[in-house]
């Protein structure tokens, strides 16, 4: 029962996490204009992995896609790749884990096969979560670097009283969504891996052997109990699991033609 609960919970947590990774990847608010130096701006800029947007006080939002591949920074491309890898792995993991769920009967699938699939999906979720966390963290690091660089040359005076304030960007909502989603996917994956251990069928063999000593009518049944731990030599209906996973991350962004100010 506990195994089923752990597996089910792991699946749900991973599902929420992957939905979050997809949402973060699609969001436009990966970086948002820092309003510290101009809190009364009538024009607000924000950027995603796929496009940049400008929201005016009028209520109109204009978004422009990055219609170039070669002209984009390598780091942005890397983040995109990480997020996409995370989504793909997560999606495959979800598909695999659906069939692995103990509460779902598919033909005459053995518990060992379900355990296998649970572990596979768990590893995929872990890698997916790590991808998302890595991607978001790379982007955040890029923002921090650019923020301090732009702060260094914030005022590029054009002589006299004219002031040109350089637009600085800070963390957007998508980064926090991505971090949380990546963490949830990771946790879900760990839970699936834990559930997999409990799913592996425990084999109990009772072998009664009678030894008839001459002149005695005593039957000996020596230590015929063998509890299968997965580390012994009894391999019937048994599999020894071990696995590790690493992951990275990537991103995308959605449209919002009429965002509101």
């Amino acid at each position: 029962m506990a195994v089923t609960a752990c597996q089910g919970l792991g699946f749900v947590v991973s599902l929420i996490g992957i939905a979050g990774i997809i949402a973060a990847t699609c969001m436009d608010q990966w970086s948002t204009q820092d309003l510290y130096n101009n809190p009364v701006t009538a024009v607000f800029n924000y950027q995603g992995l796929w496009r940049s947007c400008v929201r005016e006080s009028s209520g109109f939002t204009e978004c422009r896609g990055y219609f170039t591949l070669l002209g984009l920074p390598a780091m942005l491309q890397a983040v995109r790749a990480l997020m996409i890898v995370g989504i793909v792995l997560g999606a495959i993991g979800l598909l695999v884990s659906i069939f692995a769920l103990k509460c779902i009967r598919i033909g005459s699938m053995e518990d060992s096969a379900k355990a296998n699939m649970t572990l596979t999906s768990g590893i995929m979720f872990i890698v997916s979560g790590l991808c998302a966390i890595a991607g978001v963290s790379v982007f955040a690091n890029m923002l921090v670097t650019n923020f301090w660089m732009s702060t260094a040359n914030m005022y590029t005076g054009m002589g006299g009283m004219v002031q040109t304030v350089q637009t600085r960007y800070t963390f957007g909502a998508a980064l926090f969504v991505g971090w949380v989603a990546g963490g949830l996917t990771l946790i879900g994956g760990v839970m699936m891996c834990i559930a997999c251990r409990g799913l592996a069928p425990e084999e109990t063999n009772y072998k009664a052997v009678s030894y008839h000593a001459s002149g005695h009518s005593v039957a000996y049944k020596p230590g015929g109990f063998k509890a299968s731990t997965g580390f012994g030599s009894n391999t019937k209906n048994k599999k020894i699991y071990d696995g590790g996973a690493r992951t990275e991350d990537e991103v995308q962004s959605y449209p919002s033609k009429h965002d509101y100010v």
Partner: antibody, heavy 118, light 113 residues
Framework: EVKLVESGGGLVKPGGSLKLSCAAS????????MAWVRQAPGKGPEWVAF????????HYVDTVTGRFTISRENAKNTLYLEMRSLRSEDTAMYYC???????????WGQGTSVTVSS | DIVMTQSPSSLTVTTGEKVTMSCKSS????????????LTWYQQKPGQPPKLLIY???TRESGVPDRFTGSGSGTDFTLTISSVQAEDLAVYYC?????????FGAGTKLELK
């Protein structure tokens, strides 16, 4: 057809209060940023107050901050400007206007006159 | 606050003449996010509210004759009327639409010679 009609202006003593209304038709005010602009006799226009389409961003010119309150009633499609502690320098024609692309004011009402005098 | 300075304060012209008026801003009105200048031009005739002519410094509002042209970027902007008509006699105002308060210039009055 987009139309803005202001009302509520009049003669008021210094320190008095007035509430201006701007009835909009032909569009939904909750889709646009809205502004009040005033123009003193013989002077240029002066932007007074702004309210964003979802009403979470409100700005005032420094000279009216704390005295004027901009608000909107979406159900009535009406914009308001509540003016308290009026001064003689608040005497002007008050226009309500709709914000458009580039934060430009594309539609203006015909204005309502406010005179602050003892 | 952003200060908008218009020059000249008045212009005396004859119909058919080309007219240029200037507007200077104390701060940059170019938004890096979309590379647009948040400057608007209005025309106001006596007894009427201002009428929108040009937004984003150079985008003509629909219905505005193409003899009106806005140009400039950053802090220096210009409104040009290629061939002044009698109905163009009015006061022209520029406005900062980049930062609150959305300040107006003092205006340029176009008068007939």
């Amino acid at each position: 057809e987009v139309k803005l009609v202001e009302s509520g202006g009049g003669l008021v003593k210094p320190g008095g209060s007035l509430k201006l209304s701007c009835a909009a038709s032909g569009f939904t005010i909750s889709d646009y940023g809205m502004a009040w602009v005033r123009q003193a006799p013989g002077k240029g226009p002066e932007w007074v107050a702004f309210i964003s389409n979802l009403a979470y961003s409100i700005h005032y010119v420094d000279t009216v901050t704390g005295r004027f309150t901009i608000s909107r009633e979406n159900a009535k499609n009406t914009l308001y400007l509540e003016m308290r502690s009026l001064r003689s320098e608040d005497t002007a024609m008050y226009y309500c206007a709709r914000m458009y692309y580039g934060n430009a004011l594309d539609y203006w009402g015909q204005g309502t006159s406010v005179t602050v005098s003892s | 606050d952003i200060v908008m300075t218009q020059s000249p304060s008045s212009l005396t012209v004859t119909t058919g003449e080309k007219v240029t008026m200037s507007c200077k801003s104390s701060q940059n009105l170019l938004n890096s996010g979309n590379q647009k200048n948040y400057l608007t031009w209005y025309q106001q005739k006596p007894g009427q509210p201002p009428k929108l002519l040009i937004y984003w410094a150079s985008t003509r509002e629909s219905g505005v004759p193409d003899r009106f042209t806005g140009s400039g970027s950053g802090t220096d902007f210009t409104l040009t009327i290629s061939s002044v008509q009698a109905e163009d006699l009015a006061v022209y105002y520029c406005q900062n639409d980049y930062s609150f308060p959305l300040t107006f210039g003092a205006g340029t009055k176009l008068e007939l010679k």
